[in-house]
Interface confidence: medium
């Protein structure tokens, strides 16, 4: 089953009746699998056999770092037990799978570069045009992405990091709305009080009126 089918209803409200914050999205590694056999947005991490050292750079909390290959991130629990099929499929829409193969000696080009198909050397990505955020053997850099109309640019595309976009003021994106910005809630449900204003990466945060949660 495709990861885009993991929700039976379009997510339109927070999970509980209080909103949580989105995690910072790392720049060099993938998200945890969101559906069996598939993982969240990180084009280079998607081919598990080729990802090299961790990138030192990560997006700031709340940024959405665009990737060439996009997946709907749906909050599901995923069992990982001995013998389970937890391998990651390559759903590759823009580059041939041969580009994920190791070079003969097994070394990888560093972030910010790619493997030349002809000479085998590591070629630098062109600033503002392409990037690679992890060690790789791609035959071309991944193209920089433009922010969507409902987003603003937080940081420009560099050789090692894609364009970082965030929702415009008054809107937010969390794991329940991974591909679009949603309007911030105007208030909390009955019996809850607001403890945090809306940010580009989270709706207002509400907690139970009674303070005896004990575990938060």
């Amino acid at each position: 089953a495709s990861g885009t089918e993991a929700a039976t209803a379009t997510p339109s409200k927070v999970w509980g009746s209080s909103a949580g914050r989105i995690e910072p999205r790392g720049g060099g590694r993938g998200a945890l699998p969101t559906s069996m056999g598939q993982q969240g947005p990180s084009a280079q991490a998607r081919a598990g056999r080729v990802v090299g050292p961790r990138s030192a750079q990560g997006a700031s909390p709340g940024l959405r770092v665009h990737k060439t290959l996009k997946f709907v991130v749906v909050g599901v629990l995923l069992q990982v037990v001995p013998g389970s099929a937890a391998t990651i499929k390559v759903h590759d829409q823009s580059v041939g799978t041969q580009q994920w193969e190791h070079s003969p000696l097994g070394e990888l080009c560093p972030p910010g570069s790619h493997r030349s198909e002809h000479s085998g050397a590591c070629n630098q990505c062109t600033e503002g045009v392409g990037y690679t955020s992890a060690s790789n053997n791609l035959f071309s850099c991944l193209p920089c992405t433009a922010c969507k109309s409902d987003e603003e640019e937080r940081s420009a595309c560099t050789r090692t990091r894609n364009t970082a976009c965030q929702c415009k003021p008054g809107t937010f994106r969390n794991d329940d709305s991974a591909e679009m910005c949603r309007k911030c809630s105007t208030g909390c449900p009955r019996g809850k009080v607001k403890v945090k204003d809306c940010t580009p990466w989270s709706d207002i945060e509400c907690v139970h009126n009674e303070s005896g949660n004990g575990h938060n």
Epitope: A7, T8, A9, P11, S12, K13, V14, W15, G16, S17, S18, A19, G20, R21, I22, E23, P24, R25, G26, G28, R29, G30, A31, L32, P33, T34, S42, A45, G48, V51, R54, G58, V73, G75, V76, L77, L78, V80, N174, D175, D176, P189, G191, K192, V195, K196, S202, E205, C206, V207, H208, N213, H215, N216
Partner: antibody
Amino acid sequence: EVQLVESGGGLVKPGGSLRLSCAASGFTFSTYGMHWVRQAPGKGLEWVAGINYSGNNKYYADSVKGRFTISRDNAKNSLYLQMNSLRAEDTAVYYCARDSSTTRTRALDYWGQGTLVTVSS
Amino acid sequence: QPVLHQPPAMSSALGTTIRLTCTLRNDHDIGVYSVYWYQQRPGHPPRFLLRYFSQSDKSQGPQVPPRFSGSKDVARNRGYLSISELQPEDEAMYYCAMGARSSVTHVFGSGTQLTVLS
């Protein structure tokens, strides 16, 4: 005191159906997300399905998608799991669990005792 | 290779401190995830112990004593559960899980069976 009590488990033939229920008490049920998690004999935990506080959003594991349906009745403080087209590999103890649904926490903070579902001919 | 690796079994003596390890696969960055720990005693349902994101952002499960504590080693891509003053009732299976704070995304490890030696 938070309490979750599952019922409806039993022996069923492959291809058959069962409906599990979970009665919740001790907290404001209508403000919490809820889940079903199962554990096959001698195995680890496997999330089955989840539903948000209002019932608007439902999520399923790939292994049960199209066969199981999660639902809730906030007026009755109850969570349900309708299981159709059951298979031998669905044999497990099924737990009802509460999503903590509070600021910054996303844990399954309270669990029921579980109800055993056995699928066998 | 599983996304989360836990050693199948560990043991330690009564009254000592033990640290259980949960290693996240190399293509993921533990720095952006909360680490959750669940305890399951034989014949019982799982119990939420704690969540650890950072020293300033962590939470204890309901009625979980402070001798259970979490930590992370971002460089080694590992999460840890420390149990001090080990007691007989700590003998159980311990599952780690990881996920984003704002979603129900959890990936469970296969569990570590802890034996408390008397």
